[in-house]
């Protein structure tokens, strides 16, 4: 503890100028005071002034009023500092002396004589209020007041509580009148060293190092650190815990970058054709009559469907076509004949059969020939049977479709996955991605196709925690940890939903 006992001398009266021994001072009593402060004694005794002592210079002659003086000699009030817990009780002895010598240092002069003394014993609480008193004896009267106050930075009823305002990383506070800490705005805790984070900052996922701040722990983002960060590279997906990639509707794959609904997202089929999804990024367009091409983007000639029969030749017109019929035929499509079997109208060995009592006929064609008069060699490619841009080829009595890369099936209707070719070596896992297949390599291998054997296996040291699976060849660090449910972080080292005091790496 630390405090000051203050004594204010106000007035001293010694009208007759007498000493305690009955003698008078000549020419008058040049008066100074000695003060002794000590622990409480029921009967005041001589001995050390345990709480301190002080002397004044000469303050006046015989009777005088003592003025307040804050510095230099003759300071009033008198100061008696102490460096202990104030006990609340005291004994005080005030002696008035006459000196024939030095005004400023009468204590050192020989021949000093006692004028009078008073003794006060009692209790005194720490406080700013002055206690005023007056003591008389037969010859003299002394008016005075006194109090005990705490030294700077000391507080409490016994001046025992030390408190110094501070504003650094060991505390941000001021001191209350009782010495308790009053935290500065934005700070809390026993020592006012804990910042109050931005209002709403997530308790587990955010923290702060100064007030009104919200710093996100790994795996979280947003102003209040309440939004999880999805897996790096997640394209069309979201997360409910960090590093997840839950795919939006119509998307698939590890990174939700494989389009499972290409038809809806991209509408690739033109001219009213029908689009059918067929796996990641795969689709087939079924064209309306008069259109062809992978996306039905190519309009066919109006004559492409060979509408003219019986050897009629077709001529394209602006919005239609016109059939030029050979002799013996007429009608929009040359479908009506003026010939009979007598005219031998069936070519290529076709057999003629009379109809309608010989007014018309019908040809029965040998294999590989068709047409009303068996005039056409059968072309099995006429119906455009090959999908996805496949080329149709006649092979005698049959036809085959020559498919573009990436398609298969009798009519090239099936989309081949890039992964079907098993491009990943050494047991790597294949993923169909937009720009071709990507391989996830097992431990010990890397490269685009897992063809490179790693001499130093990044997974060998077991860098993944909490039962996570380690993969190499996916990242610059040479390994990636696939976390089990409930764990996050580049090494799956952080459990989800930690208590606020969980230690995080800065």
């Amino acid at each position: 503890g630390s405090g000051i006992f203050q004594l204010r001398l106000q007035e001293f009266v010694n009208q007759r100028g007498m000493l305690a021994n009955g003698q008078s001072c000549e020419p008058g009593c040049r008066t100074f005071f000695r003060i002794c402060l000590k622990h409480f004694q029921a009967t005041f005794s001589e001995g050390p002034c345990t709480f301190g002592n002080v002397s004044t210079p000469v303050l006046g002659t015989n009777s005088f009023v003592v003025r307040d003086k804050n510095s230099g000699s003759g300071r009033n009030p008198l100061q008696l500092p102490f460096n202990f817990t104030w006990p609340g009780t005291f004994s005080l002895n005030i002696q008035a002396w006459h000196t024939p010598g030095d005004d400023l240092r009468p204590e050192t002069s020989p021949g000093n004589s006692l004028i009078s003394q008073i003794i006060i014993q009692g209790s005194l609480a720490v406080g700013k209020i002055w206690r005023t008193d007056e003591q008389n004896d037969t010859l003299t009267r002394l008016s005075y007041s006194y109090r005990v106050i705490c030294s700077d930075n000391y507080y409490g009823e016994s001046c025992s509580r030390l408190c110094k305002k501070r504003d650094d990383h060991f505390g941000h506070y001021e001191c209350q009148p009782d010495g308790s800490l009053s935290c500065l705005p934005g700070w809390t805790g026993k020592y006012c060293d804990q910042p109050i984070c931005l209002s709403g900052c997530h308790e587990q996922n955010g923290y702060c190092s100064k007030p009104d701040e919200c710093i996100c722990r790994p795996g979280w983002q947003g102003r209040l650190c309440n939004e999880c960060i999805p897996h790096n590279g997640c394209r069309h997906g979201t997360c409910s815990i960090p590093w997840q990639c839950a795919c939006d509707e119509g998307w698939g794959g590890l990174f939700c970058d494989q389009d499972l609904n290409y038809c809806t997202h991209h509408s690739p089929c033109k001219n009213g054709s029908t689009c059918s999804n067929s796996g990641p990024k795969g689709y087939t367009c079924t064209c309306l009559p008069g259109y062809t091409g992978e996306h039905c983007e190519l309009g066919l000639s109006k004559c492409a469907s060979n509408p003219c029969r019986n050897g009629g030749s077709c001529k394209d017109q602006e919005n239609s076509y016109h059939c030029l019929c050979p002799p013996g035929y007429y009608g929009q499509h040359c479908e009506h004949s003026t010939l009979t079997c007598a005219d031998s109208p069936c070519f290529n060995g076709g057999s003629c059969r009379e109809r309608n009592q010989g007014s018309s006929y019908a040809c029965e064609c040998p294999p590989n020939f068709t047409g009303s008069n068996c005039e056409k060699k059968v072309d099995r490619c006429t119906s455009n049977p090959c999908a996805n841009g496949g080329q149709c080829q006649n092979r005698g009595p049959s036809r085959t479709c020559r498919c573009r890369p990436g398609f298969t099936g009798t009519h090239c209707e099936l989309h081949i996955s890039d992964c079907a070719r098993s491009p990943c070596a050494h047991g790597g896992t294949c993923h169909d991605l937009e720009n071709g297949p990507v391989c996830t390599c097992p431990a010990g291998f890397s490269g685009r196709r897992c063809e490179v054997r790693i001499t130093h296996d990044a997974c060998a040291s077991g860098p993944c925690f909490n039962g996570a699976t380690c993969y190499t060849g996916l990242s610059p660090n040479n390994f990636v940890c696939n976390c089990p449910y409930g764990f996050v972080g580049s090494r799956c080292e952080f459990p989800v939903g930690l208590p606020p005091s969980f230690p995080w790496v800065a």
Partner: antibody, heavy 121, light 104 residues
């Protein structure tokens, strides 16, 4: 009882970076009651405070060294580290790590045994 | 920058009282710690917050701080107290050590 142990190379070439690690045992570095500091003492001279850090990574540096100093913490390993770049012979000193206590008003109540780092080519 | 000044050395006879001063501008408004360092050893905290003793530190070590001066007092000094003593205070966010006093 908490113990602190400095580790790192004892010899560093001029213009290079001095790197030291302090491992804390017998107690968690992740307490809000402490800051973890670095103090150095050139041979035959007095103590100089370098800087400190708490468990969430808030750092404070001596202004005279601030441009060259980085202090970091790894709570998973219960360690904190010092990096001092562009060293000269004047950086030759015994480097101490210490625990500065908030309840003790910032007094450093635990110290490592110190490690001498000499800067010389 | 803030500076703390200590006398280079203080001599004392065994059993007597040694007083080590540490001065700095308005130092009384800051908390002062004192450290003892013996040759070849790490410093040891002997006083914190001006006058508080950590557990295990003998009662003969005491401290005070007012005005511009903090004082470490070793009463009844013993030969084992021979060491270097450093005062330390915090100026804003920076730790500042005194120049050190050798007690013999």
């Amino acid at each position: 009882e908490v113990q602190l142990q400095e580790s790192g190379p004892g010899l560093v070439k001029p213009s290079e970076t001095l790197s030291l690690t302090c491992t804390v045992s017998g107690g968690s570095i992740s307490s809000s009651s402490y800051y973890w500091g670095w103090i150095r003492q050139p041979p035959g001279k007095g103590l100089e405070w370098i800087g400190d850090i708490n468990y969430i990574g808030s750092t404070y540096y001596n202004p005279s060294l601030k441009s060259r100093v980085t202090i970091s913490v790894d709570t998973s390993k219960n360690q904190f580290s010092l990096k001092l770049s562009s060293v000269t012979a004047a950086d030759t000193a015994v480097y101490y790590c210490a625990r500065e206590s908030v309840p003790l008003g910032g007094g450093a109540d635990e110290w490592g045994q110190g490690t001498l780092v000499t800067v010389s080519s | 920058s803030y500076e703390l000044t200590q006398p280079p050395s203080v001599s004392v006879s065994p059993g007597q009282t040694a007083s080590i001063t540490c001065s700095g501008d308005m130092l009384g408004d800051k908390y002062v710690s004192w450290y003892q360092q013996k040759p070849g050893q790490s410093p040891v905290l002997v006083i914190y917050e001006d006058s508080q003793r950590p557990s295990g530190i003998p009662e003969r070590f005491s401290g005070s701080n007012s005005g511009d001066t903090a004082t470490l007092t070793i009463s009844g000094t013993q030969p084992m107290d021979e060491a270097d003593y450093y005062c330390q205070a915090w100026d804003s966010e920076t730790g500042v050590f005194g120049s050190g006093t050798k007690v013999t």
